[in-house]
């Protein structure tokens, strides 16, 4: 026997214990699929959450985080405090990245600078708390006679002016 409740559209509920006809979801509740036996209570975006999309009778509310926080988890189930670039969030709050690590975002952890020598490259720009190092050509690429489509800029020692 076909379940007549399956004919009930989103935005309604159906109770098999009575005449099988669909009833509208009460205010602040929703059913996002047809054939539902109950309507779910709308999510409320309170505290560190703010409403990105209002609830309707057929879809739940969607939340974002207020300024100074960012979403974590599926459907922004949690809000985590932002830190500045060059910092990471610890149990004691935002802490500067240790030497040799960086974080270029307001979230996440400090990551180690790239080790240019592992790729046989040299450090072109030093790393900071906010930025990774920039790796340049390998030392071999800078030796005289090395073929290169664009010759490297002439190396200069500090304190020496070009001739």
């Amino acid at each position: 026997l076909q379940d007549l409740c399956s004919n009930c559209p989103a935005g309604t509920f159906c109770d098999n214990n009575r005449s099988q006809i669909c009833s509208p979801c009460p205010p602040n509740s929703f059913s996002s699929a047809g054939g539902q036996r109950t309507c779910d209570i709308c999510r409320q975006c309170k505290g560190v959450f703010k409403t990105r999309k209002e609830c309707s009778s057929t879809s739940n509310a969607e939340c974002d985080c207020i300024s100074g926080y960012h979403c974590l988890g599926a459907e922004c189930s949690m809000c985590e405090q932002d830190c500045k670039q060059g910092q990471e969030l610890t149990k004691k709050g935002c802490k500067d990245c240790c030497f040799g690590t960086f974080n270029d975002q307001k979230r996440g952890i400090c990551r180690p600078w790239t080790n240019c020598s592992l790729d046989g490259k040299s450090v072109l720009v030093n790393g900071t708390k906010e930025r990774d190092v920039v790796c340049g050509p390998s030392p071999a690429d800078l030796s005289p006679g090395a073929s290169s489509a664009t010759p490297p800029a002439p190396a200069r020692e500090p304190g020496h002016s070009p001739q």
């Epitope: 935005g11 669909c22 009833s23 509208p24 009460p26 879809s59």
Partner: antibody
């Protein structure tokens, strides 16, 4: 701000027809079912019809079944009520309301009289 | 069809007094009852849904209770703007139905 604005009411003779419209704004119209509810002068509220968000499910009060047709155009954020074979007892202010029955329009008066 | 019977038809009270309005359903409607306020020339305004939940922006002096067949709207201390007609409505089963209304008037 949620707004529902009805239009299309007026004076019509018995047996005549009218088409009411309800313009919705301030919410995602396509995600809500909609109702028509009416109120005869000096009387209580009477539910008339319901249409689901996508238009697939429709219900009518027995008093209007076969004479009234509810429809919607989600692209235009509009709800409609086509009223045929009008009778004196259909005289009322007609309100549109979201399926949560939380927001109502200001109503449009339909008078059926010869 | 579920019939909702409201009583009394008229309630004559003074500002500051407590108002108790009754709504009885002809059969079990669970908690799917709402209360509306209507003033002359205006559309109904939702006050209470799900028998006891105050809708957004509704003052705390309005409260609802009950389930099954017996429901009550209470206004703890009447303000001048509360004098109006109050309707109960059920959304448990189609056709949706409303009570005949209770008029709360100034004594």
């Amino acid at each position: 701000e949620v707004q529902l604005v009805e239009s299309g009411g007026g004076l019509v003779q018995p047996g005549g027809s009218l088409r009411l419209s309800c313009a919705a704004s301030g919410f995602t119209f396509s995600e809500f079912g909609m109702h028509w509810v009416r109120q005869a002068p000096g009387k209580g509220l009477e539910w008339v019809s319901y249409i689901s968000s996508g238009g697939s499910t429709i219900y009518y009060a027995d008093s209007v079944k076969g004479r009234f047709t509810i429809s919607r155009d989600n692209a235009k954020n509009s709800l409609y009520l086509q009223m045929n074979s009008l009778r004196a007892e259909d005289t009322a202010v007609y309100y549109c309301a979201r399926d949560w029955v939380d927001y109502w329009g200001q109503g449009t008066l339909v008078t059926v009289s010869s | 069809e579920i019939v909702l019977t409201q009583s009394p038809a008229t309630l004559s009270l003074s500002p500051g007094e407590r108002a108790t309005l009754s709504c009885k359903a002809s059969e079990n409607v669970g908690s799917y009852v709402s209360w509306y306020q209507q003033k002359p020339g205006q559309a109904p305004r939702l006050l209470i849904y799900g028998a006891s939940n105050r809708y957004t922006g509704v003052p705390a002096r309005f409260s609802g209770s009950g389930s099954g067949t017996d429901f009550t709207l209470t206004i703890s201390s009447l303000e001048p703007e509360d004098f109006a007609v109050y309707y109960c409505g059920q959304s448990y089963s189609y056709p949706l139905t409303f009570g005949g209304g209770t008029k709360v008037e100034i004594k």
